[in-house]
Structures are given as structure tokens and as C-alpha cells.
Amino acid sequence: VEVQVSEDPVVALVDTDATLRCSFSPEPGFSLAQLNLIWQLTDTKQLVHSFTEGRDQGSAYSNRTALFPDLLVQGNASLRLQRVRVTDEGSYTCFVSIQDFDSAAVSLQVAAPYSKPSMTLEPNKDLRPGNMVTITCSSYQGYPEAEVFWKDGQGVPLTGNVTTSQMANERGLFDVHSVLRVVLGANGTYSCLVRNPVLQQDAHGSVTITGQPLTF
């Protein structure tokens, strides 16, 4: 028996369902009574789901997994993982034993889009050219960690005096805060781009300083 899985990682959004594809080629006359199927976390050997002795033994992993029972006899051993969490990320191995055996591993990459950044300025009044200001760009509830880029109004990257911190909340999602310290010119636009490297999703925020008032 030969087990096949997708070579590319499966990307799943937090709180959505994901399918980890696994298939085998049943011989003519194959019946489910012959099938032994085990899904396991590759790095820890934790049992996730199993089908043995002709029946689905159910989820051993927080009751959020399911097989496709009607498709098993056709060789579809895929696993459905419901309400994906950050902690589900990793490698899963599909083990199949009929008359002989095989196994293959598939990676699950979890992702969550970042919110549109909010921009704050400190100080936020009595600003004059030559003043040092702190611009903070904050974006929330994303995964995995973001890449943050700053540019001026001409699109020139600003790399000096940037401090970025990322903190995971109790669900494992990241809140990103990036601080740019800059000396004000006569006027100018400062934009922050928060990129999710897995989703290739960019979230933009900008602040324009033209004397008073400020434009966000």
C-alpha cells in the first residue's frame, strides 16, 4: 500500500476547518475490515484519530477531528480538523496498514490575518519641524509573527529608530506594536505596513503631518 499526502503545507485560518489530505490505493476486493488507519502528531506521537478493527475509533485530540467515512473505502484517509487553533500547527503523520503498510507526513500551517493598523503619535499636538516624534503602529490578532515595514511619503524605507514588539495572547495570536522615532520635516506622511508572511496579506496604516491638524 502506498500512502500519499500533499507535499505543500496545508494553510488554515484560525477558527476555520482544515482538511489534511491522505490517500491510499485500495486493492480490488478491499473492505474496511482490513483497514487500520492512524493519524498522529509526528513530533510527539500523540494519537489524533484512528480507524481500526473495521470501525472509527473517534478523535483522541480534543474532539475536533473526523474522518470521511463514506470515502474511506475508496482510499481517502483524509482528516478533518475543526475550529483550527494556533496550537494545532505542526506535522501530522498518516499511517495506513492493510496487508502491508505505509505512512506519510503532512504539515499544517496556521494563519490569522492582521487587523488594519491603528496609528498614534506622541506628542500629538504643538508639533513643529525639527521636533522628535514617536509614531506607533499597532495591529492585532494575527499569526504567525508579522513583518513590519515603515516608509516615508516618497516610499523610501525607514529602517533606523524602529522598535517592533510582538506579544502572543492566550490564543497564541500576536499583537504587534511598532514604534518609529523620527524628526519631523515641514510636512510628511509616514506609513506602516504589517505583513503576514504566510498569507502574504498586507495591512496598511499611515499618518500625515501637515502642521495642524493631523491626518490619519
Partner: antibody
């Protein structure tokens, strides 16, 4: 070639602890799960637990879970097994075993064995 | 835990004989079964994995079969170096468990 060299024989009193070592060579230490299997005189083999040296993850036989601790020192390519609250029934030969066939089976195949360490528990 | 039961517990045979050892699992284990040979004072040696696959270096006189709950190990023509104790092991579930062993003695 793969070699697993275990520490020497131990004699312990009931209630004491013993810590055995297993020095691995001939392969990349972090790439094979390491197991501990024991065999009391005239008895069947008994799996105690395992460790993934790459990430430190352990799985234990529930029978021993409260008494056994398996660790590794990656820099020394050495695995350790500590068994506490020893009793006379723990008298056995203790083997460390490396499993290079991890993807083949859901649990383990015991391919490379150490020479064994005799632990005698006696008052 | 999955119980593994071997039969017979011991068997006497002569060089050149054909010998069969059985192993039964208390629940279905597919083909995730291994066989080991152990000689006195030595560590066990893996002979068979996945119920029927010979490990490298194992002579072809050893063969094995089975799936589900019933498995057999066969030595087609006993050689002097085959007299030892043989163990089966299930590799599907934790805790990993072994049979009680079958001692193969010279008649």
C-alpha cells in the same frame, strides 16, 4: 556503526533511586527516538518510555509514569533513565534502544540496543 | 493495554526442522507487529517488522505473516544459531507491549 554503551551494574536498596546512562555514537543523536526497555529475570520485555532527543518530548508507560524520568544531554549524546522508589520487583536488566525506523510504525521498532545494565534491588 | 500472547511457551526441535511460532493480540493491530530473537545474556535483535518484512541481514529461512490479531513466525530449516527465545511486539499503541516469549530448544 551505531553503538549504545550503557553504564555499569548497580545494586540498590528498596526505596532508593537509580540513574542509568546510555552513550550513543555512530549517528546523529537527535534524529532517533531513544527508548528504555527492561527485562526481569525470566520475564518478558517491558517498555518503560521514550524520548525524542530533538525536542525533549517524552512518552511513558503509565505503569512507570510516577517513578521514571527520561532525559538527554544532547551535547554528550547521552540518554538517561532515572527510576525512583525502587522495589525488589525492579531487579532487571535495563536496555536503552534507538529507533531509526520512526516513520514506519506509529510507536517504535527496537533496532539498536545497548548491552544492558543489571540493576539489583535488595535489602 | 494490548495484550500479546505467544504459543507455545517453549518448543523443542532439531536442526533442519520447520518451526512455527504464533502470536495473538488482544485487539486488532493491523500489520504493526515485530518479531525479535534473543540469545541468553544478549540484547534482543529485530528480525521482522510490519508483520512480514525481514530486517536487513536476517536470513531468508525466517518468514512471517498475519494481520489483525493473529500472526506467525516460521523458520523453514532450523540452524544451530536459531536456538533462542523469540518475542513478538505490537507497534500500534502505547504502551508498547511484548509477548511472553517462546523458547526454542534443541531436541
Amino acid at each position: 556503526q551505531v553503538q549504545l554503551v550503557e553504564s555499569g551494574a548497580e545494586v540498590k536498596k528498596p526505596g532508593a533511586s537509580v540513574k542509568l546512562s546510555c552513550k550513543a555514537s555512530g549517528y546523529t543523536f537527535s534524529s532517533y527516538w531513544m527508548h528504555w526497555v527492561r527485562q526481569a529475570p525470566g520475564q518478558r520485555l517491558e517498555w518503560m518510555g521514550e524520548i525524542n532527543p530533538g525536542n525533549g518530548h517524552t512518552n511513558y508507560n503509565e505503569k512507570f509514569k510516577s517513578r521514571v524520568t527520561i532525559t538527554v544531554d544532547k551535547s554528550a549524546s547521552t540518554a538517561y533513565m532515572e527510576l525512583s522508589s525502587l522495589r525488589s520487583e525492579d531487579t532487571a536488566v535495563y536496555y536503552c534502544v534507538a529507533d531509526p525506523r520512526r516513520p514506519k510504525v506509529p510507536t517504535a521498532l527496537f533496532v539498536y540496543w545497548g548491552q544492558g545494565t543489571l540493576v539489583t534491588v535488595s535489602s | 493495554d494490548i495484550q500479546m500472547t505467544q504459543s507455545p511457551s517453549s518448543v523443542s526441535a532439531s536442526v533442519g526442522d520447520r518451526v512455527t511460532i504464533s502470536c495473538r493480540a488482544s485487539q486488532g493491530i493491523g500489520t504493526w507487529l515485530a518479531w525479535y530473537q534473543q540469545k541468553p545474556g544478549k540484547a534482543p535483535r529485530l528480525l521482522i517488522y510490519a508483520a512480514s518484512s525481514l530486517d536487513s541481514g536476517v536470513p531468508s529461512r525466517f518468514s512471517a505473516s498475519g494481520s489483525g490479531t493473529d500472526f506467525t513466525l516460521t523458520i523453514s530449516s532450523l540452524q544451530p544459531e536459531d536456538f533462542a527465545t523469540y518475542y513478538c511486539q505490537q507497534a500500534i499503541n502505547f504502551p508498547i507491549t511484548f509477548g511472553q516469549g517462546t523458547r526454542l530448544e534443541i531436541k
